[in-house]
Interface confidence: low
């Protein structure tokens, strides 16, 4: 079948990194500079992505694969293939339309990206607050008051911090 197909369509013989040049009797021509073809049998090469402005090159374009970009310091990637760069904020802040704003009381953000999330509500798990929360850090829950009574045989270890993005229900 492959042999038959290649007899019918000479372009199927053109490997990645080349294109089937109709202007030159359908011979396989190398992709011109700053272009690539990642699969065989292509009739054109795609323009390489250029990492300009706030983007910087993570992987150079080759004749068979597109360039990959990431973001310059102070920014982080958003979207598939780093289609956008978003400004970093400090821990304890979130990015709004008006720029970086401090987390409201009762919320925190321990990263340079993302939104401020509510502190864990220790009492929902029957725990008490061992360490108060800040703009940058979630509260640390400790053992429940009952666990601290003189007759208690052991102290319950602190509850693990919730996964990012999971606020109390």
């Amino acid at each position: 079948f492959e042999r038959t197909r290649s007899l019918q369509d000479p372009c199927s013989n053109c490997p990645a990194g080349t294109f089937c040049d109709n202007n030159r009797n359908q011979i396989c021509s190398p992709c011109p500079p700053n272009s690539f073809s990642s699969a065989g049998g292509q009739r054109t090469c795609d323009i390489c992505r250029q990492c300009k402005g706030v983007f910087r090159t993570r992987k150079e374009c080759s004749s068979t694969s597109n360039a990959e970009c990431d973001c310059t310091p102070g920014f982080h990637c958003l979207g598939a293939g780093c289609s956008m760069c978003e400004q970093d904020c400090k821990q304890g802040q979130e990015l709004t339309k008006k720029g970086c704003k401090d987390c409201c009381f009762g919320t925190f953000n321990d990263q340079k990206r993302g939104i401020c999330r509510p502190w864990t509500n220790c009492s929902l798990d029957g725990k008490s607050v061992l360490v108060n929360g800040t703009k940058e850090r979630d509260v640390v829950c400790g053992p429940s008051p009952a666990d601290l009574s003189p007759g208690a045989s052991s102290v319950t270890p602190p509850a693990p911090a919730r996964e990012p993005g999971h606020s109390p229900q």
């Epitope: 323009i47 300009k52 402005g53 706030v54 973001c71 958003l78 979207g79």
Partner: nanobody
């Protein structure tokens, strides 16, 4: 300073064609993605399509796909919108816009664009 100056709007019959232009000045045009939006009376601003800085990738709204084509001429610092098979519902003010270097919103959100043309009426 950054400027986007539009031209080419007007009155056209259903099924007709029109080409809008958006001339940019005051910045490195070929460094930025560009988009077209439109706004009909009493409606929100609607994304039409976006073209990457080098013309290499495009994104169109379903409502215009196959009828509208965005192109750019980087040496002339100009963005174009070719509109074919126009319908009555295409009546709106059309805007070109420059994509920000970064945005927390999607490619189709107006918030992703920081500079806008003055608008061109298409009826």
């Amino acid at each position: 300073q950054v400027q986007l100056v539009q031209s080419g709007g007007g009155l056209v019959q259903p099924g007709g064609s029109l080409r809008l232009s958006c001339a940019a000045s005051g910045w490195a045009f070929d460094n930025y993605g560009m988009a077209w939006f439109r706004q009909a009376p009493g409606k929100e601003r609607e994304f039409i399509g976006r073209l990457a800085w080098n013309g290499g990738s495009t994104d169109y709204a379903d409502s215009v796909k196959g009828r509208f084509t965005i192109s750019r001429d980087n040496p002339k610092n100009t963005l174009y919108l070719q509109m074919n098979s126009l319908k009555p519902e295409d009546t709106a003010v059309y805007y070109c816009a420059r994509q920000r270097s970064y945005s927390r919103y999607g490619i189709r959100a107006p918030q992703t664009y920081d500079y806008w043309g003055q608008g061109t009426q298409v009826t």
